[in-house]
């Protein structure tokens, strides 16, 4: 009893400590650690039935998918997978958890968002944070130097997500990557083409793909006077330019990150520029930037990339944006991010980005991190932010009040009179065996009205009605639910007629 009282006091004290730290705006890491301690204390306390009733809910940052949401999701996945396959990708899968060591040192500041699993008999494990690092591990482990693959799976991040904006702790990523030594910018251009094809097919609104290159960023920081040790942290400040003003970014770089104001101003002259191939040409003439080897390589590759994007017919969707500085540590070359555009309030205003829906880039060093000899396998890829897309599609369908079918049933086997259950069971079985998606109501003697109502609600287009007279005549009454039109179909022709009406191929190939 004393033990429980002590633990209860500790839980109370720890709760106060957490609240205090939040009020003081203590570092996120410290708050996270103290919250984790609080949870461990509570776990030791265990349930006290007299005090607390278990709240039935999904864990923070997760959700269930209803049949309606799943229908949306499957449609989205279908568009994406068809595109990936059209571009000749193979598919792989990897474990949901990896050895902790595999994920360590690959994500920079984001490493603190990795979920560690409680030790299970010796191996220190973590849930995967993305699909790219496991892919690199897969390549290194199998000594592969060449593959074009896609991978659709859930990833896990200990984020504090704004779920209303389609962000979660468990979410799907849809990745497409090309690994191998190829001529410059051809695979990169294809990745951007894929991104544009998918976003256009999904019809979620106008979008823009921002493109930059890690080498240009690094070269620019070098000529502006940023020390190597500050590159990554300054990158993360610059990357905020799509959300906040240059003034705020500059204040962060100078005030919080210790950058000299004149260095920040030099960076500002560059990162506030965006345009097309003409900006690439302009920067190639820049007296300082063109003297930097890294930047020059990056600009040369971008010039080539824009040529290919023009040939692919998507150059109008691409913007060279010097403020794009994607957070992950492993990018080495071209980087890109697709944002949806809000229609401007007034004509003449610049379109406003409403958040990233796809992103990617070149990461030539990641596989080498896993290879004992450090052998590199150049890679480039993209990731579609499907959770964001699900949210947008769901909202759009709700706004349109569109009915979404959650099943694919083509026909309901119904009866007009009593005592026909055996006949319904025989017919539904025949239909299933012929590859028809069919259902029946689980009642011996259902009312015809109830059966028709069920079809209306479930969006089932056809009803196959069995009656005593129809049985004698060897026919089935086939009724269209929407037009209410009925025709007698010979039983042996029923399968073919249903397939014809529902546009299904006549053989199950």
């Amino acid at each position: 009893m004393a033990e429980r009282a002590a633990l209860e006091e500790l839980v109370k004290l720890q709760g106060e400590r957490v609240r205090g730290l939040k009020q003081q705006k203590a570092s996120a890491e410290l708050i996270e650690e103290e919250v984790a301690k609080l949870l461990k204390l509570k776990a030791q306390l265990g349930p006290d039935e007299s005090k607390q009733k278990f709240v039935l809910k999904t864990p923070k940052g997760t959700r269930d998918y209803s049949p309606r949401q799943m229908a949306v999701r499957e449609k989205v996945f279908d568009v994406i997978i068809r595109c990936f396959k059209r571009h000749g990708a193979e598919v792989i899968d990897t474990p949901v958890f990896e050895l902790k060591e595999t994920l360590m040192g690959k994500y920079g500041e984001d490493s603190k968002l990795i979920y560690d699993l409680k030790d299970q008999g010796g191996e220190l494990l973590s849930l995967r944070y993305d699909l790219t690092v496991p892919f690199a591990r897969y390549l290194a482990m199998n000594k592969l130097t060449n593959i074009k693959r896609y991978h659709i799976a859930k990833v896990y991040r200990r984020d504090n997500p704004a779920m209303t904006r389609g962000r979660y702790r468990e979410f799907y990523q849809c990745d497409f990557d090309i690994a191998g030594n190829f001529d410059p910018m051809i695979p990169d251009a294809e990745c951007l083409k894929i991104m544009c094809e998918i976003l256009s097919s999904l019809q979620i609104g106008d979008f823009l793909v921002k493109v930059n290159d890690r080498r240009i960023l690094d070269g620019m920081f070098a000529i502006c006077g940023v020390s190597d040790s500050k590159f990554r942290t300054i990158c993360s400040s610059v990357d905020k330019l799509d959300k906040v003003s240059w003034e705020e970014v500059k204040n962060e770089m100078v005030g919080e990150k210790g950058l000299a104001p004149e260095v920040a101003d030099r960076i500002g002259d560059y990162v506030q520029q965006h345009g097309g191939v003409s900006l690439v040409e302009q920067l190639l003439q820049d007296p300082k930037l063109s003297q930097n080897k890294q930047a020059l390589e990056g600009l040369g590759d971008l010039k080539l990339l824009f040529e290919y994007l023009t040939l692919f017919g998507i150059d109008d969707k691409i913007s060279f944006d010097l403020s794009l500085a994607r957070g992950l540590d492993y990018y080495t070359g071209v980087i890109y991010e697709a944002v949806l555009l809000q229609t401007p309030a007034q004509a003449g205003e610049e379109p406003l980005g409403v958040g990233s829906v796809a992103a990617g880039g070149r990461y030539d060093g990641l596989v080498g991190m896993f290879d004992p000899k450090g052998r590199k396998v150049p890679c480039v890829g993209l990731s579609i932010g499907v959770e964001r897309i699900f949210s947008i599609v769901e909202q759009r369908l709700e706004a349109l009040e569109e009915k979404i079918r959650t099943t694919e049933t083509q026909v309901l086997v119904a009866s007009a009179q009593k005592k026909l259950l055996e006949e319904r069971l025989k017919l539904v079985s025949e239909l299933w065996d012929a590859g028809i998606k069919a259902e029946l109501l689980y009642k011996k003697n259902p009312k015809l009205l109830n059966q028709l109502q069920y079809c209306e609600e479930a969006g089932i287009p056809l009803v196959a009605i069995i009656g005593e007279q129809e049985l004698k005549d060897g026919v089935i009454k086939l009724r269209s639910v929407t037009s209410r039109e009925e025709v007698d179909v010979r039983r042996e022709d029923l399968v073919e007629e249903i397939k014809r009406r529902t546009g299904q191929p006549l053989c199950i190939c």
């Epitope: 006091e9 500790l10 004290l13 400590r17 650690e33 984790a36 204390l41 030791q44 030790d119 220190l124």
Partner: antibody, heavy 120, light 107 residues
């Protein structure tokens, strides 16, 4: 019963290195935060470093930060302290200690200590 | 860093006496305080945690009180085995710091 046994102490020259180990038994090691606490001869106690149950969090007192590294191997029920660039003022008995109620920074269980002497 | 100051530095007392040792924190630490007993050549032993909770197996003659910045350890009736050095420690924020110790000697 809970047992913590330190090893690895000894005499080392200034600038040298030592690795202390602590073998734990009698409890579920992977559930507990662990720490190293030291006591210079005839002096008080100083909390040197701690490590969380999964190694996600580690902290060091200012005087050792950058020179000492705390680590653990949950599979082996072992805690370690890698001490580099040792100084005369690091001379002390080093205790391995287990947190109270898994996460409370109060040393509930202590080892017998291992003496580290830094001297030329 | 939070400084912990114990008083007195040493105290002489006899078996059966009531002894009080105080500990002051340089800033508020709520109830995040522990008391330890250490005998020569041995590791410290936990007596009291979060200011007033008696560690299991510790005799009830030991008690702790206080919160914020001022704390006390009281031994209601000294026993021969209680002669040792006593330390307080704050567990509020890292670096966790100990008092300089109070040596309890036989009068």
């Amino acid at each position: 019963q809970v047992q913590l046994v330190e090893s690895g102490g000894g005499l080392v020259k200034p600038g040298g290195s030592l690795r202390l180990s602590c073998a734990a038994s009698g409890f579920t090691f992977s559930d507990y935060y662990m720490s190293w606490i030291r006591q210079a001869p005839g002096k008080g106690l100083e909390w040197v470093s701690y490590i969380s149950d999964s190694s996600r969090y580690t902290k060091y007192t200012d005087s050792v930060r950058g020179r000492f590294t705390i680590s653990r191997d949950n599979a082996k029920n072992s805690l370690y302290l890698q001490m580099n660039s040792l100084r005369a003022e690091d001379t002390a008995v080093y205790y391995c200690a287990r947190y109270l109620y898994q996460v409370i920074a109060i040393a509930k269980s202590w080892g017998q200590g291992t003496l580290v002497t830094v001297s030329s | 860093d939070i400084q912990m100051t114990q008083s007195p530095s040493s105290v002489s007392a006899s078996v059966g006496d009531r002894v009080t040792i105080t500990c002051r924190a340089s800033q508020g630490i709520s109830s995040w305080l522990a008391w330890f007993q250490q005998k020569p050549g041995k590791a410290p032993k936990l007596l009291i945690f979060v200011a007033s909770n008696l560690e299991s197996g510790v005799p009830s003659r030991f008690s702790g009180s206080g919160s914020g910045t001022d704390f006390t350890l009281t031994i209601s009736s000294l026993q021969p085995e209680d002669f040792a050095t006593y330390y307080c420690q704050q567990a509020n924020s890292f670096p966790y710091t100990f008092g300089q110790g109070t040596k309890l000697e036989i009068k």
